[in-house]
Amino acid sequence: KKEDGESTAPTPRPKVLRCKCHHHCPEDSVNNICSTDGYCFTMIEEDDSGLPVVTSGCLGLEGSDFQCRDTPIPHQRRSIECCTERNECNKDLHPTLPPLKNRDFVDGPIHHR
């Protein structure tokens, strides 16, 4: 049973899926198109300087159900959306960064003397 607030990955297709790729194109991609047995994705995350970076591409079927669930990671602002309903469907995905929590400002790395 799906828990409230948990998004599951879309249904896999019975055939190869073409996806737009950006910053995440495999070596076999042509014209920024990759192919997969799994999902297309678009992801937004903060880089080291706190700027939002959008990447998109292909996720293989194996393990992608977990990756597409977008489980929150402490101290990492990141959001991913996945799709399979049509080729290049990730062109229309627009994930947004989760809001900053107050403690994100104050919680720094813990240093032990």
Partner: antibody
Framework: QVQLQQPGAELVMPGASVKLSCKAS????????MHWVKQRPGQGLEWIGE????????TYNQKFKDKATLTVDKSSSTAYMQLINLTSEDSAVYYC??????????WGQGTALTVSS | DIVMTQSPSSLAMSVGQKVTMSCKSS????????????LAWYQQKPGQSPKLLVY???TRESGVPDRFIGSGSGTDFTLTISSVQAEDLADYFC?????????FGGGTKLEIK
């Protein structure tokens, strides 16, 4: 059983256009890609392009992008390829072929296109 | 575009002999994410359309006799017919489906002595 039915032959005049057909049966048409392949005597096989019938998404071999246009009619499970500005170089056998994962598991019998006045 | 080169262009064998034909690609067809080689072999008998024999370099298509054996990895591939039969008279083509445009080798014509 899976079948891809193509007309046996077409004869057209130079400069004209032709629309080749490929009627699919024995499987769910939208669950597979359809490809078109050209074969000239002694010149092997050339991939022209592909179409996904479910969303009509196409990819073309750059060599054929100004020559061929791929379409489908989902209601009749038929794929089409239109060829324009025909010359003797376009005389060949044209096959439609089905794929799920980019290798071609079923082929039509081919249409022999002759361009001649 | 990936160039596929087949050799020999033709060969004549007697029934019962072992046949090997080669297919070389201008770049590797091995995908690192799944360690599969994106190469297929087809048989085309005179006056007929091509028929799939082998995909992913070594997986025999359902219904294909087990005398047809695909092998190889990276850029060098082989189709072996362990004991050739009269009905194997045909042209044999390899095809890469690693990167578009999908390309075919020039073919090997098998004649029966």
């Amino acid at each position: 059983q899976v079948q891809l039915q193509q007309p046996g032959a077409e004869l057209v005049m130079p400069g004209a256009s032709v629309k080749l057909s490929c009627k699919a049966s024995g499987y769910t048409f939208t669950n597979y890609w359809m490809h078109w392949v050209k074969q000239r005597p002694g010149q092997g096989l050339e991939w022209i392009g592909e179409i996904d019938p479910s969303d009509v998404y196409t990819t073309y071999n750059q060599k054929f992008k100004d020559k061929a246009t791929l379409t489908v009619d989902k209601s009749s499970s038929t794929a089409y390829m239109q060829l324009i500005n025909l010359t003797s170089e376009d005389s060949a056998v044209y096959y439609c072929a089905r794929s799920g994962w980019d290798y071609f598991d079923y082929w039509g019998q081919g249409t022999a296109l002759t361009v001649s006045s | 575009d990936i160039v596929m080169t087949q050799s020999p262009s033709s060969l004549a064998m007697s029934v019962g002999q072992k046949v090997t034909m080669s297919c070389k690609s201008s770049q590797s067809l091995l995908k690192s994410n799944n360690q599969k080689n994106y190469l297929a072999w087809y048989q085309q008998k005179p006056g007929q359309s091509p028929k799939l024999l082998v995909y992913f370099a070594s997986t025999r298509e359902s219904g294909v006799p087990d005398r047809f054996i695909g092998s190889g990895s990276g850029t060098d591939f082989t189709l072996t017919i362990s004991s050739v039969q009269a009905e194997d008279l045909a042209d044999y083509f390899c095809q890469q489906y690693y990167s578009t445009p999908w390309t075919f080798g020039g073919g090997t014509k098998l004649e029966i002595k």
